[in-house]
């Protein structure tokens, strides 16, 4: 009885089970009752990658430089040529017949996976705590600056597109400014005291001094802000006095309206 099915690596033709041609070879003639299947090797620029009964080998793929392609792996009689894209480009499809430039991740997005010759850039939105302020095919989302590690505080919150803005802490500023101001005041006070002492010791020209009761001198009266009825003079951080603006009444602890 003629066979209805053949073994692996065989095919049925004219009631005969014939051997398939091995990879890298094409079919020249089917087997007969008296002869084996005849196969011939594929030529230099051709291939067949399976056990087959093909009468023609397939042409190797051409990696067209005009389409941005280059050879990644040269074809053999058993394998096709593998093309890939030039730097900065990736394949448009799985078959890689042409190439397109890698896309850039816009601000607010970072590179999750850098593009290869066969895959495009994969972008991801920058999560909270990260930002990207550039359009790039390489840069990942960067973490916000940590103000704490620099002994600073956040003055402006970060976004997915901007970093945080750091500034000095209020307490820290006070710790620096107050001792400086106190130091300056102390020096001024000393100078005033020395000056007053000198003035007090100066003898009157020829005029005899009438006997007077010792008078308590209140040095504080001469100091700014010692008169509760007088307006308080504003000062800048640098301890410089601010002159009262013309046309404005002096008011204590009254906030100006914006």
């Amino acid at each position: 009885e003629p066979p209805t099915a053949c073994r692996e690596k065989q095919y049925l033709i004219n009631s005969q089970c014939c051997s398939l041609c091995q990879p890298g070879q094409k079919l020249v003639s089917d087997c007969t009752e008296f002869t084996e299947t005849e196969c011939l090797p594929c030529s230099e620029s051709e291939f067949l990658d399976t056990w087959n009964r093909e009468t023609r080998c397939h042409q190797h793929k051409y990696c067209d430089p005009n389409l941005g392609l280059r050879v990644q792996q040269k074809g053999t009689s058993e394998t096709d040529t593998i093309c890939t894209c030039e730097e900065g480009l990736h394949c448009m499809s799985e078959s890689c017949e042409s190439c397109v430039p890698h896309r850039s991740c816009l601000p607010g997005f970072g590179v999750k996976q850098i593009a290869t010759g066969v895959s495009d850039t994969i972008c991801e939105p920058c999560p909270v705590g990260f930002f990207s302020n550039v359009s790039s095919a390489f840069e990942k989302c960067r973490p916000w600056t940590s103000c704490e590690t620099k002994d600073l505080v956040v003055q402006q919150a970060g976004t997915n597109k901007t970093d945080v803005v750091c500034g000095p802490q209020d307490r820290q500023r006070a710790l620096v400014v107050i001792p400086i101001c106190l130091g300056i005041l102390f020096v001024i006070l000393l100078l005033v005291l020395v000056f007053i002492k000198k003035v007090a010791k100066k003898p009157n020209d020829k005029a005899p001094h009438p006997k007077q009761e010792p008078q308590e001198i209140n040095f504080l009266d001469d100091l700014p802000g010692s008169n509760p009825a007088a307006p308080v003079q504003e000062t800048l951080h640098g301890c410089q006095p601010v002159t009262q603006e013309d046309g404005k009444e002096s008011r204590i602890s009254v906030q100006e309206r914006q």
Epitope: V28, D30, T32, E33
Partner: antibody, heavy 112, light 112 residues
């Protein structure tokens, strides 16, 4: 159905050449198979002489040395046997065959 | 060359009997692909040989299942299960594994 038919002279003089034609119908000799010449001597002994393949290449029985030539005419779907320098020992019935199909044979006598 | 030795040279049988013919090769007929190109032919009186069995055991189209072939390597057998009058003639084995192709000397099947 595949059919083969031999033709040629029935009588050849010694030292001359024997030329036979095989006409094939029902199958192209360029498609596949080996197209053989076989002879049968008196007393039934069979001898394979040689073949021409579908692609035109040949293979001959070394016993026939350089006396044998098998050619073909693909336009007429025919193949040919030429045997040079015949002797009386070449007297036989000559068959052309694809092996699964045979011609009816032609008797050739070598005699002066 | 491969020598094929057939036995017996003559086989007298009664109609309806089983007949077995042996063909021994001087070397293995199995090729590198594992195929064995050993064939059996019947030549009826006044006719050209006709193919019965190819590749040891495969019946050619139209051949009755009374005919079967077995064997491997160098030993092969053709068996006719129930001989009929139309089976009479000379049986040949032929190997086409190696060039030159060679025939057995033939076995004549005749009525007792």
């Amino acid at each position: 159905e595949v059919q083969l038919q031999e033709s040629g002279p029935g009588l050849v003089k010694p030292s001359q050449s024997l030329s036979l034609t095989c006409s094939v119908t029902g199958y192209s000799i360029t498609t596949n198979y080996y197209w053989n010449w076989i002879r049968q001597f008196p007393g039934n002994k069979l001898e394979w002489m040689g073949y021409i393949k579908y692609d035109g290449s040949n293979n001959y029985n070394p016993s026939l040395k350089n006396r044998i030539s098998i050619t073909r005419d693909t336009s007429k779907n025919q193949f040919f046997l030429k045997l040079n320098s015949v002797t009386t020992e070449d007297t036989a019935t000559y068959y052309c065959a694809r092996l699964d199909y045979w011609g009816q044979g032609t008797s050739v006598t070598v005699s002066s | 060359d491969i020598v094929l030795t057939q036995s017996p040279l003559s086989l007298p049988v009664s109609l309806g009997d089983q007949a077995s013919i042996s063909c021994r090769s001087s070397q293995s007929l199995e090729n590198s692909n594992g195929n064995t190109f050993l064939n059996w032919f019947l030549q009826k009186p006044g006719q050209s040989p006709q193919l019965l069995i190819y590749k040891v055991s495969n019946r050619f189209s139209g051949v009755l299942d009374r005919f079967s072939g077995t064997g491997s390597g160098t030993d092969f057998t053709l068996t006719i299960s129930r001989v009929e009058a139309e089976d009479l003639g000379v049986y040949f084995c032929l190997q086409v594994t190696h060039v030159p192709f060679t025939f057995g000397s033939g076995t004549k099947l005749e009525i007792k």
